[in-house]
């Protein structure tokens, strides 16, 4: 940056480097030039040379003032004209930063996602804080009164296996930048309750010939969980509200639910589940596209989840890769 | 065992600063802990300083009061831990104690054998 | 900011017989609580962790209870030795910017 050149003076930011955005700020041009006494001094912003609001204080010093200043980063350097000297001497330079104390940090929530070994601890940051802002996040035993801190940017994955402090834990989360530091709430958790189940994922779905045509969802998860509740929602895609049925589901075997749908609509499908009683869900399953026929159907056939089937025929939808939910973090 | 061991009894003038250490032995510097500052005006109760977190990474929190004026700092290297009080006036004679439990745990099963400072011109 | 109130400040008791301190936090501290005893002209020494646990190498006399923000620390009988004064304090934590103590202002036990 532009800290790294050689110097042949001073130059200085009040009321500091990092300030707080919208601020008035000086910004301070010191010449230790050996034989100049500088005629001129000169300020450049972003390689930009300032014309307005240049004060004079001395023979070696000159002061530039900004008010309101609201940019996130700038680089300054400041320059002098020497007698004698056909080009400005560059006297020294260095790169400002403007931005906001950090938020307390809200909405703590720590999830477990099964299989994946890991406690992954997320919250809301709050407002954008244009500046390099750290997070501490305290997890400390209710057992053992042990405490694991672990810094990072943003969220943090917490290996399960370090958790020995027992089943229940504290956990907050300490933010901190140049301008300030806030700390979150304490969140009370136990590890078992904090379990999301393995991915429900809709597999296919068939409408088959009866009295009244019916939709048959096939779907299903790999948890280990045994009390496990589900919901699924689905709506035309021509519309703007979803209806939604609850499952209490027991994945030993795969799900099939049955749905009465209007024919020759394009219906959107997804799941999600939580152990039974707690609190935390998954987040929808990727969308699933299914159309149904026209008229009542005869035989059996598959078509894909693209547009493509034949009218008339009984029509498969299979999940052919992942589309992503509309609402993916939806875990509260 | 954890054993702390103060550096010793200092006497200064108002406006200087104070640096006082705390040898420990017996703490796994593997492992996360905490070391805590705590002073004791004559006739008084127990006074908060403040604490360094030394794990996978260094923390420090001081007592509202001591912000700006103390810095605790660590030396794995000697197992030292560190207190400086800048700004020195007569109201911070006190004994002066490093306190720990070896680990992460913020009550203290070990203490040092204190430090007297005496702040008079 | 958490504070840590002890009651009674000067506590007379007669050797046999039982105490009882009290602390009270300004918020919820969970079992977060230890209690010392410091005897003139020493550091102090750790009674109570975890509001009830007892630490080691401490005569089971001592007892301590309590959760949230209410705790108490009871002598079953007390000895001339128990003598000087008890401190409670709180562990929860010690990151939040506002603390200003983290131990109650302590209580003077003596014989009567």
């Known amino acids: 940056g532009i800290t790294n050149i050689n110097c042949s003076g001073h130059i200085w930011v009040e009321p500091a480097t990092i300030f707080k955005m919208g601020m008035n700020i000086s910004i301070y041009c010191q010449a230790a030039i050996k034989n100049c006494q500088p005629r001129k001094l000169h300020f450049y912003k972003n390689g930009i040379k300032e014309r307005f609001q240049i004060t004079r204080i001395n023979k070696t010093t000159a002061r530039l003032w900004y008010k309101n200043f609201l940019e996130p980063h700038a680089s300054m350097y400041c320059t002098a004209e020497c007698p004698k000297h056909f080009q400005e001497t560059l006297i020294c330079g260095k790169d400002i930063s403007s931005g906001y104390p950090p938020d307390i940090p809200d909405e703590v929530t720590c999830v477990i996602y099964e299989y994946s070994g890991n406690m992954t601890c997320t919250w809301n940051a709050g407002k954008l804080t244009y500046i390099d802002t750290k997070y501490v996040v305290h997890v400390k035993s209710l057992e053992t009164e042990e405490e694991q801190q672990y810094l990072t940017s943003s969220y943090i994955n917490i290996s399960t296996d370090s958790l020995q402090g027992g089943k229940k834990y504290l956990v907050w989360v300490q933010a901190a930048n140049a301008l300030g530091m806030e700390e979150s709430k304490q969140l009370q958790i136990h590890l078992d309750d904090i379990v999301i189940p393995s991915a429900a994922v809709i597999s296919r779905a068939e409408t088959i010939n009866a009295t009244v045509p019916k939709t048959i969802i096939y779907w299903d998860s790999q948890t280990t969980i045994e009390k496990v509740s589900c919901e699924m929602r689905y709506k035309a895609t021509t519309n703007q509200t979803w209806n939604v049925k609850e499952f209490d589901t027991n994945f030993t075997y795969v799900q099939q639910s049955e749905f009465y749908l209007e024919p020759n609509i394009k219906y959107v499908f997804q799941v999600r589940c939580q152990e039974t009683g707690k609190r935390y869900w998954q987040p929808w399953s990727s969308l699933f596209f299914h159309k149904t026929p026209e008229t009542v159907p005869q035989v059996t056939s598959k078509a894909f989840q693209h547009d493509t089937w034949n009218s008339g025929l009984t029509v498969a939808s299979i999940s052919t890769g992942h589309l992503t939910s509309d609402n993916r973090g939806d875990i509260g | 065992q954890v054993q702390l061991v103060q550096s010793g009894a200092e006497v200064k003038k108002p406006g200087s600063s104070v640096k006082v250490s705390c040898k420990a032995s017996?703490?796994?510097?593997?492992?996360?802990?905490?070391m805590c500052w705590v002073r004791q005006a004559p006739g008084q109760g127990l006074e908060w300083m403040g604490c360094i977190y030394v794990g996978s990474h260094v923390n420090t929190y001081y007592a509202n009061w001591a912000k700006g004026r103390v810095t605790i700092t660590a030396d794995e290297s000697t197992s030292t831990a560190y207190m400086e009080l800048s700004s020195l006036r007569s109201e911070d004679t006190a004994v002066y104690y490093c306190?720990?439990?070896?680990?992460?745990?913020?009550?203290?099963?070990?203490w040092g054998q204190g430090t007297l400072v005496t702040v008079s011109s | 900011d958490i504070v840590m109130t002890q009651s009674p400040l000067s506590l007379p008791v007669t050797p046999g017989e039982p105490a009882s301190i009290s602390c009270q936090a300004s918020?919820?501290?969970?079992?977060?609580l230890a209690w010392y005893l410091q005897k003139p002209g020493q550091s102090p020494q750790l009674l109570i962790y975890s509001a009830s646990k007892l630490a080691a190498g401490v005569p089971d006399r001592f007892s301590g209870s309590g959760s949230g923000t209410d705790f108490t620390l009871k002598i079953s009988r007390v000895e001339a030795e128990d003598v000087g004064v008890y401190y409670c304090q709180q562990t929860n934590r010690y990151s939040n910017p506002d603390i200003y103590n983290v131990f109650g202002q302590g209580t003077k036990v003596e014989i009567k």
């Open positions: 017996g703490i796994d510097f593997n492992s996360n802990y905490y």
């Open positions: 918020e919820n501290i969970y079992s977060f």
């Open positions: 306190a720990t439990s070896g680990s992460s745990v913020l009550y203290f099963k070990f």
